[in-house]
Interface confidence: low
């Protein structure tokens, strides 16, 4: 992915649509790879994370990896292609709107997932149970 | 509150030249991608042009391809729409238009209160 | 291009009618149908998108329905600021493209 301060150079009326033709264009993610977290024990976090983003590709999505082994708690923001996987995962909510974290199996360690596709959605993680049960939020039509 | 606020407009002879701008205001505009949007004397809307949020990529409707251009400067939160070898059927109220094709949903809001552009010799 | 066709083209109506608009599409675009209201002189304004989502300050007697190719748009309880002219438009494939609009004028 590319800095948000490096100009890109694409030639103009080149358009990236997706499986539906709708326009696509890359959206803004926090990014900034692994962090050392004070999140622990909350139904919500800030990501504080400063770097913002340009998805190098149109298809990109969202990312927070929130982990956590017996000597600290890391989070991850990252872009990512939600075709490939992540950690070995399938990014399954990566139409959402909002981060949901959701729990994975990993040996030695409590792992969180979640990904999301909307402007800088992966600064706000979101480990509530109230957002992982059929909330209507999340069944908006969301579309780029 | 946001504002969008078209400016540039008036009256141009065919094959003349316009740059309309629209100065933005009341949200983070180097965040979304924005939209022109037109609509010519007692007629409907028709889509014009989109740029992308960091304005490295561009799209436009067929009939302005080569002649029309979008752009913006993140820096001032204004939009722009250069509009060269225009033709009498250019002539409509031109809106500018946060949204579409920006993260999230595929919608134009909100929109400027828009410009007139007239073409005629 | 996707053709989007409104029907009808105007119609009257009184204070208090329930008013219904219906948008069809040339072939099926999802959900991705977007309604806004304009006024003589006025920006248009988002009313509903994603074919029924109601859109954040608009009153809730405004609704969308539809998916596939066929689409409505109701007023149940038509207000006097509701007499304006009503536009469909599709997101689903480049250019994205608007209905002709519909005229609700004062019976």
């Known amino acids: 992915t590319i800095p948000p301060h490096v100009q890109k150079s694409v030639n103009n009326d080149m358009i990236v649509t997706d499986n539906n033709g709708a326009v696509k264009f890359p959206q803004l993610c926090k990014f900034c790879d692994v962090r050392f977290s004070t999140c622990d024990n909350q139904k919500s976090c800030m990501s504080n994370c400063s770097i913002t983003s340009i998805c190098e590709k149109p298809q990109e999505v969202c990312v927070a990896v929130w982990r956590k082994n017996d000597e600290n708690i890391t989070l991850e923001t990252v872009c990512h292609d939600p075709k490939l996987p992540y950690h070995d995962f399938i990014l399954e909510d990566a139409a959402s709107p909002k981060c949901i974290m959701k729990e994975k199996k990993k040996p030695g360690e409590t792992f969180f997932m979640c990904s999301c596709s909307s402007d800088e959605c992966n600064d706000n993680i979101i480990f509530s149970e109230e957002y992982n049960t059929s909330n209507p939020d999340l069944l908006l039509v969301i579309f780029q | 509150q946001v504002q969008l606020v078209e400016s540039g407009g008036g009256l141009v002879q065919p094959g003349g030249s316009l740059r309309l701008s629209c100065a933005v205001s009341?949200?983070?505009?180097?965040?979304?991608?924005m939209s022109w949007v037109r609509q010519a004397p007692g007629k409907g809307l028709e889509w014009v042009s989109s740029?992308?949020?960091?304005?490295?990529?561009?799209h436009n409707t067929d009939s302005v391809k080569g002649r029309f251009s979008i752009s913006r400067d993140n820096s001032k939160n204004t939009l722009y729409l250069q509009m060269n070898s225009l033709r009498a059927e250019d002539t409509a109220v031109y809106f500018c238009?946060?949204?579409?094709?920006?993260?999230?949903?595929?919608?134009?809001?909100?929109w400027g209160q828009g410009t007139l552009v007239t073409v005629s010799s | 291009d996707i053709q989007m066709t409104q029907s009808p083209s105007s119609l009257s109506a009184s204070v208090g009618d329930r008013v219904t608009i219906t948008c069809r599409a040339s072939?099926?675009?999802?959900?991705?149908l977007n309604w806004y209201q304009q006024k003589p002189g006025k920006a248009p304004k988002l009313l509903i998108y994603?074919?029924?989502s109601l859109q954040s300050g608009v009153p809730s007697r405004f609704s969308g329905s539809g998916s596939g190719t066929d689409f409505t748009l109701t007023i149940s309880s038509l207000q006097p600021e509701d007499f304006a002219t009503y536009y469909c438009?599709?997101?689903?494939?480049?250019?994205?493209?608007f209905g002709q609009g519909t005229k609700v004028e004062i019976k």
């Open positions: 072939q099926s675009i999802s959900s991705y």
């Open positions: 740029i992308s949020a960091s304005g490295d990529r561009t």
């Open positions: 238009a946060k949204g579409l094709a920006a993260s999230g949903k595929n919608y134009f809001d909100p």
């Open positions: 009341g949200f983070k505009f180097r965040r979304y991608a």
């Open positions: 994603a074919a029924s």
């Open positions: 438009q599709q997101s689903y494939s480049t250019p994205p493209t």
